[in-house]
């Protein structure tokens, strides 16, 4: 074989270069034919009525032609012919890659509730070959299920992702990313999750600052409730008892002036929204007034589990006997 060609892969709309090379030339006519076996070039002359073909180089050892604005219909075998005895022929295959026309992401619900499973679909239309779709929630890759539909040598890929949402997912992007040989860099589309969740309630002691409650002192507790939608109702109650008469309620704040031992007990902040309700408890223990001048040594330890936060305050030498759990979130 005296005639050589190389296969060509080109992205739709770009330029393909076809080269016919002759090892030992005897000045025979070299001709390039299209997949319909019509002559594109006869040596350096183009008889074919398609001006997208242009001569790059012609010599006795090479015919090199460019094809601009390549379309899917240009795909196929191109033949180099050498008018020798016997005539020689070699073919090159042009493969046309088509990037996905459109990338669409569709979420089953605009707003989901924590714990709910939602369906997210991503469609990459009319590519060749078929597109690979990858899913990410933030930076975490997830596994979807893809279906491929073929029509006229083009592929439409739809990938389905079933996603159980959590409150932490609120505002996190769900990313549909395509991988395709005709696409350089990242081609992706994303939608931000909107997740509604029941309130998370935290009680913060804003006074006294050192955290030790003694007779005669004041106590101020602030209830922080975060949820989506933002909780409409934040209420304070005293568990198993009436609220002290000298307690003042002001929105999320509970203020008890002139503490005494009868105020001991559990104070609960309750918050609710359309998703549900939650509460956090504060256990008040009122200590005797101080008998010594030096300030007490205070150690604060916070222990967190997935469902409950326990705040333990060890206040002085008696705390070994009287140490109490002060705040519990539910």
């Amino acid at each position: 074989q005296n005639l050589f060609t190389k296969d060509v892969t080109v992205i739709e709309g770009e330029v393909a270069t076809i080269s016919c090379q002759v090892n030992k030339s005897d000045d025979s006519v070299i001709q390039l034919l299209n997949p319909n076996r019509q002559t594109i070039y006869f040596r350096d002359f183009r008889p074919l009525k398609d001006s997208r073909f242009q001569l790059l180089n012609f010599s006795s050892s090479e015919l090199k032609v460019s094809l601009t604005n390549v379309s899917i219909s240009d795909e196929g075998r191109y033949f180099c012919q050498l008018y020798t005895d016997p005539p020689q022929e070699s073919y090159t295959t042009i493969t046309v890659l088509v990037p996905p026309r459109n990338l669409m992401i569709d979420i089953q619900k605009d707003t989901a509730v924590e714990g709910e499973e939602i369906e997210v679909n991503c469609t990459a239309m009319a590519s060749k070959p078929a597109t690979t779709i990858r899913w990410f929630k933030g930076n975490t890759e997830l596994k979807g299920k893809s279906e491929v539909e073929e029509w006229s040598d083009m592929y439409t890929v739809t990938s389905q992702l079933m996603l159980k949402v959590h409150k932490e997912d609120d505002g996190v992007p769900v990313i549909c990313q395509v991988e395709h040989p005709a696409v350089t860099g990242n081609l992706q589309t994303q939608r931000y999750l909107e997740v509604q969740y029941k309130p998370q309630v935290h009680i913060q002691m804003t006074y006294p600052l050192q955290g030790l409650t003694r007779e005669g002192d004041a106590l101020e507790l602030t209830c922080e409730a975060i949820g989506k939608p933002q909780p409409v109702m934040v209420t304070w109650v005293r568990v198993d008892d009436e609220m002290p008469q000298h307690a003042v309620l002001s929105g999320p704040n509970l203020f008890i002036n002139n503490l005494n031992k009868t105020d001991n007990g559990t104070y609960r902040c309750e918050a609710s929204n359309i998703v549900g309700k939650a509460h956090s408890d504060y256990m008040l223990y009122v200590y005797d007034p101080p008998t010594t001048i030096p300030p007490p040594t205070t150690t604060t330890t916070t222990t967190t589990t997935t469902t409950t936060t326990i705040l333990t305050i060890i206040t002085d030498s008696r705390a070994g006997e009287e140490g109490s759990i002060r705040a519990v979130d539910h």
């Epitope: 000045d27 006519v29 076996r37 019509q38 002559t39 040596r43 008889p47 020798t84 005895d85 005539p87």
Partner: antibody
Amino acid sequence: EVQLLESGGGLVQPGGSLRLSCAASGFTFSFYPMQWVRQAPGKGLEWVSSIGSSGGYTKYADSVKGRFTISRDNSKNTLYLQMNSLRAEDTAVYYCTRDRWYFDLWGRGTL
Amino acid sequence: QSELTQDPAVSVALGHTVKITCQGDTFRTYYASWYQQKPGQAPLLVVYGENKRPSGIPDRFSGSTSGNTASLTITGAQAEDEADYYCHSRDNSGHLHVFGGGTKVTVL
């Protein structure tokens, strides 16, 4: 001067033979495919035969296939047409022409 | 074998424009070439490819193709343009040649 000059035409009986020659000058003969085209008296042009630049490739019109043979001698810059089993309808002026897909150079013809 | 069809004769007033047409399926694929032949002379290439002219051919000669019809236009015909004009192409395989029957152009 770039030119083609045909010779070898003449009167021959039906069934007879004739060999036409075409001498090329002024260009690299071995580089070009060549053709024979004929024109019967008062008629249009009719393509007869083609040959590749090295001589290995040949094609014929259906009307002459099996009776005519095209050949070339690149060392002599000459194109030939061997015509056998001649018929009255082969009467024509025979032109040799240079092939670049189109025919850009013609001889004056031989009858 | 393909066939190319030409009108047998057309006439044109001196200095006017004449269009000679040639019909054939091959022109859907390939460009035509056109040859001028005066009495007693060999044919002469006047137009080829995508409206190209060999050197020495006046620019009043131009070629075009549309669908299966190739055309040769002489814009501002001169007395010396009176001749027979032949269209030529190859069949779709590119191996066999075919000529039109010729059009006799008379300049009045």
